[in-house]
Interface confidence: low
């Protein structure tokens, strides 16, 4: 003897992301020689058995037997969203509901607000902003490998009424070590599946130089070629060198090129040697130590900079 | 007359070596950065090595790095490219270019020469 | 290295009309201090040297005729000619030269419709 419960047909929620398919299913053990039925937030009907009710391309018969009726709709939109009914029509008639949630996918995130020309200890700003996300999204910024705390994150109804736009800012101090770096803004939500989706904002710090010297070979002897590379580093890179000679007068020379030669290194050329490599954001000296020796014993050399 | 002339190009069969000759005349040779270009046949242009105008700074393409060596005799407006170790695929025309540090441009070409390398 | 992808590869154009060839560079190329895109654009003719036609991505050298124009700026740069002559005939290449190793583009072959 069945009971009530067998002429009950059951059904599920479901969520899906918006351009995506959803498969509506809804089962009964005893249909009582009735038909299912599918009906859509607007009461229309969808399907009766296997018999299309509604001109729609989008929505697709999967399954039609006495227990069970499914049908997929595909291209879901945001108007979609609502809650369907299955039914059977017994006596009386018996409905079930399945409350289908539309997702709606974030677009790439928009980064804002970058001022070229950021010099070093300067204070920067960035706004990201995504829309189109339902339920609203959720904005992460990163340096690089490193966290940045933005500010939380902002929603605003988008004009559809259906969908939420997110904006999120942060600021921060650049460093010389930031020049190059990459902030990025990723947007975080269910209908992305754990896939990135994010933006980058490469960022250029401008620095005062340094620079170091450096010999070539690192061990000169009296009567080899020697190379005294100014290694200059900024940004800019240093474009004007200024070598000097301790005790020297006028300066040795003064030279775009950032490396100091020796053709035939003499005991007199011994002393300390001062490069100043200069930018459009100031200088930098560094100082070299250079004791030539005889020939055969390695001569003793030390540098130092400041 | 502007001019770059190239020579020292042939046939060199792999792991051989050539050196070639860029003969600058109709301007002063030792204010420009000098540079190798080459173009593999039915290919496209690779930059190869520069070189300062005074010669200390010098820089080279990965692929050259080891094998080839640049250098300059601004005394008698030459520009060089030593090349050992050579391979198949460094065949290619060479041509050496001026390139003004105000333009940035490799304003000034030579007509080039063929380098086959080869068994 | 900085990639420079020209397109397209080839283009046919009527005498007299414009042709337009791209140059895309992975990174930028401007350098913010002097505000300047390290870029240039030769024309190559078979059987001869490349010839500089624009350098400074906008800046025609001298001797080029003045229907050969560059723009662009950070990564994305154009070489227009306003109206094609037969002696325009070439293969044309971009190269970036704002850090070592110096790159070209592909190249573009250029050819009369």
């Known amino acids: 003897n069945l009971s009530q419960d067998d002429s009950q047909p059951w059904t599920s929620d479901e969520t899906v992301v918006a351009g995506g398919t959803v498969v509506l299913k809804c089962q009964v053990k005893d249909h009582e020689d009735s038909s299912l039925q599918w009906s859509n937030p607007a009461q229309q009907t969808l399907y009766f058995g296997e018999k299309r009710a509604l001109r729609d391309n989008r929505i697709q018969l999967v399954t039609s037997t006495p227990h069970e009726l499914s049908i997929s709709i595909s291209n879901v939109a945001l108007a979609d969203e609502g809650e369907y009914t299955c039914s059977i029509f017994t006596m009386p008639v018996r409905t079930a509901k399945s409350l289908v949630t539309v997702l709606g996918i974030p677009q790439k995130p928009i980064i804002t607000g970058y001022k070229s020309s950021l010099r070093e200890k300067d204070t920067a700003t960035l706004n990201c902003q995504s829309s189109g996300s339902k339920p609203a999204a959720r904005l992460t910024w990163r340096k690089g490998d490193q966290e940045l705390h933005g500010e939380p994150t902002r929603i605003q109804e988008d004009p559809n009424g259906k969908t939420f736009t997110v904006s999120s800012s942060v600021t921060f101090q650049v460093t010389r070590e930031d020049d190059g770096a990459s902030i990025v803004c990723s947007v975080n939500h269910e209908s992305l599946k754990g896939a990135d989706r994010s933006t980058s904002q490469r960022i250029e710090v401008l620095y005062t130089p340094t620079a170091m010297i450096r010999p070539d070979p690192p061990h000169p002897r009296e009567g080899q070629k020697l190379l005294l590379h100014c290694e200059g580093r900024g940004n800019p890179v240093p474009q004007q060198y200024l070598w000097e000679k301790e005790g020297s007068v006028p300066p040795l020379k003064m030279t775009q090129e950032s490396a100091l030669i020796f053709p035939f290194l003499n005991k007199s050329d011994s002393g300390t040697y001062g490069c100043t490599a200069t930018s459009n954001m100031g200088s930098y000296k560094a100082y070299y130590t250079l004791n030539v020796n005889d020939p055969s014993p390695v001569p003793s050399s030390s540098s130092t900079y400041h | 007359e502007v001019q770059l002339v190239e020579s020292g190009g042939g046939l060199v069969q792999p792991g051989g070596a050539l050196r070639l000759s860029c003969s600058a005349s109709?301007?002063?040779?030792?204010?420009?950065?000098m540079h190798w270009v080459r173009q593999a046949p039915g290919k496209g242009l690779e930059w190869v090595s520069q070189?300062?105008?005074?010669?200390?700074?010098?820089d080279s393409a990965d692929f050259v790095k080891g094998r080839f060596a640049v250098s300059r005799d601004n005394a008698k407006d030459l520009l060089y490219l030593q090349m050992n170790s050579l391979r198949a695929d460094d065949t290619a025309v060479y041509y050496c270019?001026?390139?003004?540090?105000?333009?940035?441009?490799?304003?000034?070409w030579g007509q080039g020469t063929m380098v086959t390398v080869s068994s | 290295d900085i990639v420079m992808t020209q397109s397209p590869d080839s283009l046919a154009v009527s005498l007299g009309e414009r042709a337009t060839i791209n140059c895309k560079s992975s990174?930028?190329?401007?350098?913010?201090?002097?505000?300047?895109?390290?870029l240039a654009w030769y024309q190559q003719k078979p059987g001869q040297p490349p010839k500089l036609l624009i350098y400074?991505?906008?800046t025609r050298e001298s001797g080029v005729p003045d229907r050969f124009s560059g723009s662009g700026s950070g990564t994305d740069f154009t070489l227009t000619i306003s109206s094609l002559q037969a002696e325009d005939v070439a293969v044309y290449y971009c190269?970036?030269?704002?850090?070592?190793?110096?790159?070209f583009g592909q190249g573009t072959k250029l050819e009369i419709k």
């Open positions: 270019a001026r390139g003004p540090l105000a333009k940035n441009g490799f304003d000034i």
């Open positions: 109709g301007f002063t040779f030792s204010g420009y950065w």
């Open positions: 070189i300062s105008s005074s010669g200390t700074i010098i």
């Open positions: 990174q930028s190329v401007l350098y913010s201090s002097n505000n300047k895109n390290y």
């Open positions: 400074w991505a906008s």
């Open positions: 190269q970036q030269y704002y850090s070592t190793p110096y790159t």
